[in-house]
């Protein structure tokens, strides 16, 4: 348990043996739009009730049609895959060493909640203290994408800006996708207000996922540094 | 293991409608239509969720066709309105074990039913 008395969950869904990944033999992109750069970045979906399993499915297909357009590799694109609710389960985690398409299946497999809380504060607390507690590749952009679609209650938000401030003082970028009519704006405003790189983008509901994710997944990307040149042997 | 039958197709005038019913043998969670066109591929048409009722339907067929499901029964339904001979095609229904795969990719599911055919003549 962290000290602020956060559970920490188990780090893995039930995934088939581990095959060995050998990172130089990638798999081929999928798409015209391919991110190559160094990345860390963390999907965190919001799995209270106030979307329905339909909806959460959409969810999910937008985060493995993302994971399509990142070169997904311990060197360049990696990923970490958070379900969110009263507490915080991590699907894949940043250290994961499987093939791009056996991270995104573990994405498809994300579990529906239903809860009737996803504690935005709780989540980016689990952001602070386990996926960002030590930066092991200060070289690399981090990016938390926030996929939120309810209000947390205000018993759970008196941490939230502490929260925001202690990730933007790591150097993670916040990024909040308000989904429907009861994403809590508030809080997006809170997020965007900390750091000019926490721009937000609020739909008013799953489907319109889809229309936005080039723009999303762009936006990611120019934020990430491009991998230096090979050095060249004097 | 989950047995799958559908029933309810036929020949049918563009602009009519049917209505597809697939039995399910045993408990299901998620329960879909997909069906496949003469010399296509399968495509996802609509789905339903057990736990909330929950659907989601393909954008060609949104607004005309809509899937429901009697929980006591064990049975999903395809309503099928304004028909249009572009709707032809082998009508299947489908269920998984796990979620493995998109709601809308074939390798999702794991069980499949023998495939009901549907024709609209203009």
């Known amino acids: 348990q962290e000290p602020g008395g956060l559970v920490v969950p188990p780090t893995d869904a039930p995934v088939s043996p581990t095959t060995l990944y050998v990172e130089d033999i990638s798999e081929p992109p999928l798409h015209d739009f391919y991110c190559s750069r160094l990345l860390d970045l963390v999907f965190l979906l919001d799995g209270s009730s106030r979307l329905s399993e339909a909806e959460f499915e959409v969810l999910k297909a937008f985060v493995v049609d993302m994971m399509e357009r990142l070169r997904i590799s311990q060197k360049w694109v990696r990923v970490a895959v958070v379900e969110y609710h009263d507490g915080s389960h991590a699907y894949i985690g940043l250290k994961d060493r499987k093939r791009p398409s056996e991270l995104r299946r573990i994405a498809s497999q994300v579990k529906y909640a239903g809860s009737q809380v996803a504690s935005t504060s709780e989540v980016l607390k689990y952001t602070l203290f386990q996926i960002f507690s030590k930066i092991d590749r200060p070289e690399a952009s981090r990016i938390a994408l926030l996929l939120m679609a309810s209000q947390e209650p205000q018993r759970m938000s008196r941490n939230f800006v502490r929260y925001v401030q202690g990730l933007k003082k790591k150097k993670v970028i916040v990024i909040p996708v308000g989904i429907g009519p009861h994403a809590n704006l508030k809080q997006i405003r809170l997020i965007e207000k900390q750091a000019p790189e926490n721009k937000a983008f609020v739909l008013s509901s799953v489907d319109e996922l889809e229309q936005q994710r080039d723009e999303i997944v762009s936006y990611l990307c120019d934020l990430a540094p491009e991998a230096p040149p090979p050095t060249l042997p004097p | 293991q989950v047995q799958l039958v559908e029933s309810g197709g036929g020949l049918v005038q563009a602009g009519g409608s049917l209505r597809l019913s697939c039995a399910a043998s045993?408990?299901?969670?998620?329960m879909a239509w997909f069906r496949q066109p003469p010399g296509k591929e399968r495509e996802f048409v609509a789905v339903i969720y057990s736990s909330d009722g929950s659907t989601l339907v393909a954008a060609s067929v949104k607004g005309r066709f809509t899937i429901s499901r009697d929980n006591a029964k064990n049975t999903v339904y395809l309503q099928m309105t304004s028909l249009k001979p572009a709707d032809t095609a082998v009508y299947y229904c489908?269920?998984?074990?796990?979620?493995?795969?998109?709601?809308?990719?074939?390798?999702?599911?794991?069980?499949w039913g023998q495939g009901t055919q549907v024709t609209v003549s203009s």
């Open positions: 045993g408990r299901t969670k998620d």
């Open positions: 489908a269920t998984s074990r796990g979620y493995s795969g998109t709601y809308y990719s074939t390798s999702r599911y794991d069980y």
